[in-house]
Amino acid sequence: AQNITARIGEPLVLKCKGAPKKPPQRLEWKLNTGRTEAWKVLSPQGGGPWDSVARVLPNGSLFLPAVGIQDEGIFRCQAMNRNGKETKSNYRVRVYQIPGKPEIVDSASELTAGVPNKVGTCVSEGSYPAGTLSWHLDGKPLVPNEKGVSVKEQTRRHPETGLFTLQSELMVTPARGGDPRPTFSCSFSPGLPRHRALRTAPIQPRVWEPVPLEEVQLVVEPEGGAVAPGGTVTLTCEVPAQPSPQIHWMKDGVPLPLPPSPVLILPEIGPQDQGTYSCVATHSSHGPQESRAVSISIIEPGEEGPTAGSVGGSGLGTLALA
């Protein structure tokens, strides 16, 4: 079958090969499209409601005055010339619609280095088939799930027109000491080949470098974090920053379901409470900051406790709180 692409709303003429140029003609068009159940047969005589959708012209060609999504499918013509020789034409018709130029909405004017930021949402309206949206940084394609890049996509279809609206939300974590004015753009690539991509106007947010924070200190009492069963451990999170940030607590890397507090009192310690504890300070202007982790363990009477309960490094990395 010969592949034909036609723009939605435009006319389409399909030639019936081998058909005499004018009547009388022995030919038959068969259609299997979104408008038909199985095959529909059209003859030169025509007439009826189908004339508004597709009709056979005097030269045997099939004429569709305004192609729609439902006209996608197979079109076949079987014609016999004056000598009785049979010729078959076979077309696969696919339709398309180029959307309006994509746009970036809800774009950020400023990004913070070292933490995830929403850059903006790219929107393309009125495409068929759906096509795809992709993001570019300084002209180079951005690959989702690489180097702090994440993309959330959504595709919606208009209930009446059948055309697609695409949305793509870009989140990035700019590197510290990187480009202070990166250029982001988004492009729409049509689902059908041979149509060029459409690109948005670029956006150039500023990248703000937060001043490195003083380290979050975690103090454990009793020192070393070893306690007898049923004893109490007090963890204090000391943050030099003003105003005081919200302090949450982690155990074995998982958030503890507790109200925010700079002091964590662990009374009546039991075996289930052993593990590594850390605190996370969340500032309104900075990303979250984690303390070192301390190990809490139970010592049976007569045992000597460890001298230091610290594990891991500086704990200055950023992390997402559940």
Partner: antibody, heavy 120, light 107 residues
């Protein structure tokens, strides 16, 4: 011994608010958390939220974020829940419970409950 | 939110019988589960904490266990004061959630 003594039953009008208290004794009030739980007549239990009396920090069940305000007075070792814009759906028994960040202390002791009836 | 599906909702049993109540967690809660007992007058008492640890003063006939996402409270030999309501409670993550309860009735 640990005790959580709750205030008496309340009969209140729709649209008004009510404050239920939970007085703690027999332990260091600042070292533990107070959880609040709702039980409608003949129904199950629903967690409302928790307060750390030492820091004043709270966490709420999203469902009760607007409805319930949790506070604590360290000087009297008393925790409070204030319920606002009352409707018949708020008619229930409200419990306080003592908790902490350790397994052994989670919801270990319970108050006797306070019945709040909202009626015109 | 984590759903706690408790079964059965009611259970008729005889004195001396062994019974088990179950709660199924919709997400991983580790061992962060309590079993609570509620008397007809509304008094609530914790029986089991951290899935299987018995509270002090609670009779040894009560025990807690876990198999995957299913948590069980077993009473080895029912006594007359055991015919009350029981609830499970998960405290692994906010918001904490309870099972819908089991009413234990005397046959």
């Amino acid at each position: 011994q640990v005790q959580l003594q709750q205030s008496g039953a309340e009969l209140v009008r729709p649209g008004t608010s009510v404050k239920v208290s939970c007085k703690a004794s027999g332990y260091a009030f600042n070292n533990y958390l107070i959880e609040w739980i709702k039980q409608r007549p003949g129904q199950g239990l629903e967690w409302i939220g928790v307060i750390n009396p030492g820091s004043g920090g709270t966490n709420h069940n999203e469902k009760f974020k607007v409805k319930a305000t949790l506070t604590a007075d360290k000087s009297s070792s008393t925790a409070y829940i204030q319920l606002s814009s009352l409707t018949s759906d708020d008619s229930a028994v409200y419990f306080c419970a003592r908790s902490a960040g350790t397994a052994r202390a989670r919801f270990a002791y319970w108050g006797q409950g306070t019945l709040v009836t909202v009626s015109a | 939110d984590i759903q706690m599906t408790q079964s059965p909702s009611s259970l008729s049993a005889s004195l001396g019988e062994r019974v088990s109540l179950t709660c199924r967690a919709s997400q991983d809660i580790g061992s962060s589960l309590n079993w609570l007992q509620q008397e007809p007058d509304g008094t609530i008492k914790r029986l089991i904490y951290a899935t299987s640890s018995l509270d002090s003063g609670v009779p040894k006939r009560f025990s807690g266990s876990r198999s995957g996402s299913d948590y069980s409270l077993t009473i080895s030999s029912l006594e007359s004061e055991d015919f009350v309501d029981y609830y499970c409670l998960q405290y692994a993550s906010f918001p904490f959630t309870f099972g819908s309860g089991t009413k234990l009735e005397i046959k």
